[in-house]
């Protein structure tokens, strides 16, 4: 059966939106008015992985782009990147682990934990206009909580 996907946007708990800031980079900043259409639309696919009531494995692709968020080691540090894939083969139910995030719902907020690197989360900075990154701390300065907005296909 084909993998189930939905289209959505994400905002961090400070209401910063995510935009493409480079061919393989996202950043977070406050948008308003017409600028809101600049935010990236994700195609969130529900993939194979360890699942529980509040933890669901997903892959985060960019809608209509052959790009997925992935987690890799760079200079011995878990790092978030946008990775180009062959559209003929993606999305698929059994995604490679670097593409998988555990979507964790707590108090109507979402966290995205790397399946490859447990306790590392998709994060944004408090500061405006900074790259989205993989952070190894929760509850500190950096933001790991998001809200999801559904987008019609």
């Amino acid at each position: 059966a084909p993998v189930r996907s939905l289209n959505c946007t994400l905002r961090d708990s400070q209401q910063k939106s995510l935009v493409m800031s480079g061919p393989y980079e996202l950043k977070a900043l406050h948008l308003q008015g017409q600028d809101m259409e600049q935010q990236v639309v994700f195609s969130m696919s529900f993939v194979q992985g360890e699942e529980s009531n509040d933890k669901i494995p997903v892959a985060l692709g960019l809608k209509e782009k052959n790009l997925y968020l992935s987690c890799v080691l760079k200079d011995d540090k878990p790092t978030l990147q946008l990775e180009s894939v062959d559209p003929k083969n993606y999305p698929k139910k059994k995604m490679e682990k670097r593409f998988v995030f555990n979507k964790i719902e707590i108090n109507n907020k979402l966290e995205f934990e790397s399946a490859q690197f447990p306790n590392w989360y998709i994060s944004t900075s408090q500061a405006e206009n900074m790259p989205v990154f993989l952070g190894g701390t929760k509850g500190g300065q950096d933001i790991t909580d998001f809200t999801m907005q559904f987008v019609s296909s």
């Epitope: 935009v19 493409m20 800031s21 480079g22 061919p23 980079e25 950043k27 900043l29 948008l31 600028d35 259409e37 600049q38 990236v40 639309v41 960019l62 809608k63 209509e64 782009k65 052959n66 180009s84 559209p87 206009n129 790259p131 987008v151």
Partner: antibody
């Protein structure tokens, strides 16, 4: 809006910088593209300066052009122009609508003539 | 990669007639296609984006369709003011690309 400037007659090999001045939107949010059009020919994409500051180039343009920006301007440097670079150069804002890149609005263009 | 082939290169149409311009992408671009109109000596103007959405202020005589690799721009009830060159543009990828535009179609109105 966007408006180009700096186009002029130059001799081959003389570096030239074109400037795109933007107003009404932020270069922290929007990517800007450069496109050129040789006399009587079609539109040819040169490259982008992304909102994060990195540049992407058409495969043929790498090494020949450099795109950079300040808070309100985007520069296109033609490092060593040849007669083949004679064209009208346009800049445009890149709108990302559901991740799809669309060019709007466009500037009126600035003419570069390369001749000895 | 992502080469855009536009046909025909030129077409002559009578006032009130209909013209169809085709654009083919060498790889799947979903709905990531825009169409622009350029009149001689002027800047290009966005007509249609996301394959079929009309840009603000563009008359409904213009319509776009298609997805994947095959796309069409149709202009009906042609007016003299529609004489221009029309370009398609893929907006999906900017990596290792020669040109994001098709070669253009000149529409001559008789």
């Amino acid at each position: 809006s966007v408006e180009e400037s700096g186009g002029r007659l130059v001799t081959p090999g003389t570096p030239l910088i074109l400037t795109c001045t933007v107003s009404g939107f932020s270069l922290d949010v929007y990517t800007v593209t450069w496109v050129r059009q040789a006399p009587g020919k079609g539109l040819e994409w040169i490259g982008y300066i992304w909102s994060g500051g990195s540049a992407s180039y058409a495969s043929w343009a790498k090494g020949r052009f450099t795109i950079s920006k300040t808070s309100t301007t985007v520069d296109l440097k033609i490092s060593s122009p040849t007669t083949e670079d004679t064209a009208t150069y346009f800049c445009a804002r890149v709108k990302m609508i559901s991740n799809i890149e669309t060019f709007d609005p466009w500037g009126p263009g600035t003419l570069v003539t390369v001749s000895s | 990669a992502y080469d855009m082939t536009q046909t025909p290169a030129s077409v002559e149409v009578v006032v009130g007639g209909t013209v169809t311009i085709k654009c083919q992408a060498s790889e799947r671009i979903y709905s990531g296609l825009a169409w622009y109109q350029q009149k001689p000596g002027q800047r290009p103007k966005l007509l249609i984006y996301r394959a079929s959405t009309l840009a603000s202020g563009v008359p409904s005589r213009f319509s776009g369709s298609g997805s994947g690799t095959e796309f069409t721009l149709t202009i009906s009830d042609l007016e003299c003011a529609d004489a221009a060159t029309y370009y398609c543009h893929q907006g999906v990828s900017s990596s290792d690309i020669d040109n994001v535009f098709g070669g253009g179609t000149e529409v001559v109105v008789k």
